[in-house]
Amino acid sequence: GGGGSKHKCFRNSLENNETLESIMNTLESEEDFRKYFYYLEGSK
């Protein structure tokens, strides 16, 4: 089912010259990253 598709997609992404670390970096919170610069930028 859906779980199998997700697993396959994840496995394929790893095969496309990606590492788990690079995937986690991509998922890094934009909110956390913004803390390293002008924190109020883009805030409401």
Epitope: N25, T26, E30, D32, K35, Y36, F37, Y38, Y39, L40, E41
Partner: antibody
Framework: QVQVVESGGGVVQPGRSLRLSCAAS????????MHWVRQAPGKGLEWVTV????????NYADSVKGRFTISRDNSKNTLYLQMNSLRAEDTAMYYC???????????WGQGTMVTVSS | DIVMTQTPLSSPVTLGQPASISCRSS???????????LSWLQQRPGQPPRLLIY???NRFSGVPDRFSGSGAGTDFTLKISRVEADDVGVYYC?????????FGPGTKVDIK
């Protein structure tokens, strides 16, 4: 006016420690991430470390990880860099830079020189 | 780490003439928020670096409109439309898309 001023540099022997300071003025220090960047004599720029606006998040270049510690005191508008186990290759001008809008380093200090030599 | 390269490394220019510096990154600088965090810095002799351009093409406050930035993805350019004596120095591109933040090796601009 908006500025940052570094201090604390000097000549130190290999293996010893040094603490740099960066005094900020003219802006709300506690709203900005702050960075240290260094430049060895006659060489290019190297990013060293960053601390988030509130001090909760830090990141370091591999070359200084485990030896350097960045910290800040928002009540004093001051950024610090504690440098331990110093090596000859740490010899450089150390600049404090503000992480500004557009994820850019928009304000730079004049730098403080650190020389590691026996 | 993202490696930044610049060409040329040295650029002798004539006063009043244009100059162009190229910067290339080893991987795309487009962040997940859709922005590209590529900036250009100028370092005059004996001075600290100074921000010229951020997010590829945005001039920082006080920077003359003689300076312009362009590019996308992995290829970027800084152009000086008419070089003035004040422009002598080293120009660095820098990426703040991904840790560790990295700089290009610098391009030295001087007058012929």
């Amino acid at each position: 006016q908006v500025q940052v001023v570094e201090s604390g540099g000097g000549v130190v022997q290999p293996g010893r420690s040094l603490r740099l300071s960066c005094a900020a003025s003219g802006f709300t220090f506690s709203n900005y991430g702050m960075h240290w960047v260094r430049q060895a004599p006659g060489k290019g720029l190297e990013w060293v470390t960053v601390i988030s606006y509130d001090g909760s998040n830090k990141n370091y270049a591999d070359s200084v990880k485990g030896r350097f510690t960045i910290s800040r005191d928002n009540s004093k508008n001051t950024l610090y860099l504690q440098m331990n186990s110093l090596r000859a290759e740490d010899t450089a001008m150390y600049y404090c830079a503000r992480g500004g809008s557009g994820f850019a380093f928009d304000i730079w200090g004049q730098g403080t020189m650190v020389t590691v030599s026996s | 780490d993202i490696v930044m390269t610049q060409t040329p490394l040295s650029s002798p220019v004539t006063l009043g003439q244009p100059a162009s510096i190229s910067c290339r990154s080893s991987q795309s600088l487009v962040r997940s928020d859709g922005n590209t965090y590529l900036s250009w810095l100028q370092q005059r002799p004996g001075q600290p670096p100074r921000l010229l351009i951020y997010k590829i093409s945005n001039r920082f406050s006080g920077v003359p409109d003689r300076f312009s930035g362009s590019g996308a993805g992995t290829d970027f350019t800084l152009k000086i439309s008419r070089v003035e004596a004040d422009d002598v120095g080293v120009y660095y591109c820098m990426q703040t898309t991904q840790f560790p933040f990295t700089f290009g090796p610098g391009t030295k601009v001087d007058i012929k």
